[in-house]
């Protein structure tokens, strides 16, 4: 019995279906086929879980979190024992193993390993202002998404004709901040933050209204 080499790792967007491949060759009929799919979750590496089981011509559910979401891609028994996982969750990220036994065929490699990474687009970021909006002050524009795998980068732009930030602005695309020093009336306006990663982008807006000092009455 020989389990074929797997592609190594698979990436899928959260909520989308994933297919984890596992095929094998055997010299024996598939009468006593026994397949166990296990996962070592990234979030809990010392707690392997059963995903799905095929034994004695019957299928059995694995861990409760997979119930109703997992199945074999083809009719069993077969030499293709790949599985699908529907509506993938972040917690599905991990290392998956298919363990195949088909008595009396013994020996050879009976385990296939595939990594699954569930990617998450940046969630709707929150935009906020830190600091006084009085003229001459320094302000920080903050932008952050609660979710995003890989970690999002952030790009700020000012929604005017140029889409350029004021000349006194410095941007940190990793932290999602823009520091604008010595704000003036020209700093006022609508700013947009674009959070992006490998599978998506999201945006939020922020209105910076620089406050000019009120003229004082001379008594």
């Amino acid at each position: 019995l020989e389990v074929s080499e797997s592609p190594g790792s698979i990436q899928v967007a959260r909520g989308q279906p994933a297919v984890l491949p596992c095929t094998f060759t055997t010299s024996a009929a598939l009468i006593n086929l026994n397949v166990i799919w296990m996962v070592t979750p990234l979030s809990n590496a010392n707690q392997p879980e059963q995903v799905i089981l095929y034994q004695g011509g019957q299928m059995f559910d694995g861990a409760p979190r997979f119930h109703g979401r997992v199945g074999f891609t083809g009719t069993m028994p077969a030499t293709n024992v790949s599985i699908f996982i529907n509506n993938t969750q972040l917690s599905d990220t991990g290392t998956y193993q298919c363990l195949v036994n088909n008595l009396p065929d013994i020996g050879g490699r009976n385990i296939g390993v595939t990594g699954l990474t569930v990617l998450v687009p940046p969630s709707a970021p929150h935009c906020q202002i830190q600091g006084s909006q009085d003229i001459g002050s320094d302000v920080i524009l903050l932008c952050s998404s609660e979710e995003g795998i890989p970690r999002p980068t952030y790009l700020w732009e000012k929604l005017d004709n140029t889409l350029k930030l004021p000349p006194t602005a410095t941007q940190d695309q990793v932290q999602g901040t823009v520091t604008i020093r010595n704000i003036s009336a020209l700093s006022s306006g609508l700013y947009q933050c674009v959070a992006s990663n490998a599978i998506g982008t999201s945006t939020c807006l922020l209105d910076l209204q620089v406050i000019s000092p009120q003229p004082r009455n001379i008594g």
């Epitope: 909520g15 687009p121 929150h126 906020q128 979710e147 306006g189 609508l190 999201s202 807006l205």
Partner: antibody
């Protein structure tokens, strides 16, 4: 009373321009962006753009770029939307709507009652 | 660029619950918040839900919003349906500088 009061219905010929007004009362006019949204008869809502009443800065939907002009007069708390080169497809009710930016996302919490603009030869 | 797609119409009896979906055509539904508006015949729209599920204080708690990642859609649920709920309902989101503010096509709710 917080409200937006719009100008009356207009009938225009193709190729002409129309200017719709929207007078704000009961709140600080310069404190909120004003948006314009239109609705053709029996159709859905279509966003046209915004104006910042404080600065006069504008942002227009690509579809209307070059044909729409949004202005304001802060002394009378009024926003204006002018649409030029009118065609029959521009027949619609035009709404002004106050824009709120909660945590970075537009929503419209106050609407005018709408101005019907009919384009007909 | 993405679109927001809503069912053209739904109908239900008074007292029952109705759910209206708003499906995003591309990109994740979680990437930009969704708002919901009610438009009664002959009137301007009014806000019902903002930021997916937040409800302005004047809106009855019979109206609720949610999102579902697997179907990439937002939903508006109206429970304890009343005849006064007969109206058009629109979802709305933001598509960045290229698209600006987007509205779904609207759903007509009929109370039987």
């Amino acid at each position: 009373q917080v409200q937006l009061v719009q100008s009356g219905a207009e009938v225009k010929k193709p190729g002409a321009s129309v200017k719709v007004s929207c007078k704000a009362s009961g709140y600080t006019f310069t404190g909120y962006y004003m948006h314009w949204v239109r609705q053709a008869p029996g159709q859905g809502l279509e966003w046209m753009g915004w104006i910042n009443p404080n600065s006069g800065n504008t942002g227009y939907a690509q579809k209307f770029q070059g044909r729409v002009t949004m202005t304001r007069n802060t002394s009378i708390s009024t926003a204006y939307m002018e649409l030029s080169s009118l065609r029959s497809e521009d027949t619609a009710v035009y709404y002004c709507a106050r824009g709120r930016l909660e945590r970075g996302y537009w929503y419209f919490d106050l609407w005018g009652r709408g101005t019907l603009v009919t384009v007909s030869s | 660029n993405f679109m927001l797609t809503q069912p053209h119409s739904v109908s239900e009896s008074p007292g029952r619950t109705v759910t209206i979906s708003c499906t995003r055509s591309s990109g994740s539904i979680t990437s930009n918040y969704v708002q919901w508006y009610q438009q009664r015949p002959g009137s301007a729209p009014t806000i019902l839900i903002y930021e997916d599920k937040e409800r302005p204080s004047e809106v009855p708690d019979r109206f609720s919003g949610s999102i579902d990642i697997s179907s990439n859609s937002a939903s508006l649920t109206i429970s304890g349906l009343k005849t006064e709920d007969e109206a058009d309902y629109y979802c709305q989101s933001y598509g960045g500088t290229s698209q600006g503010v987007l509205f779904g096509g609207g759903t007509k709710v009929t109370v039987l």
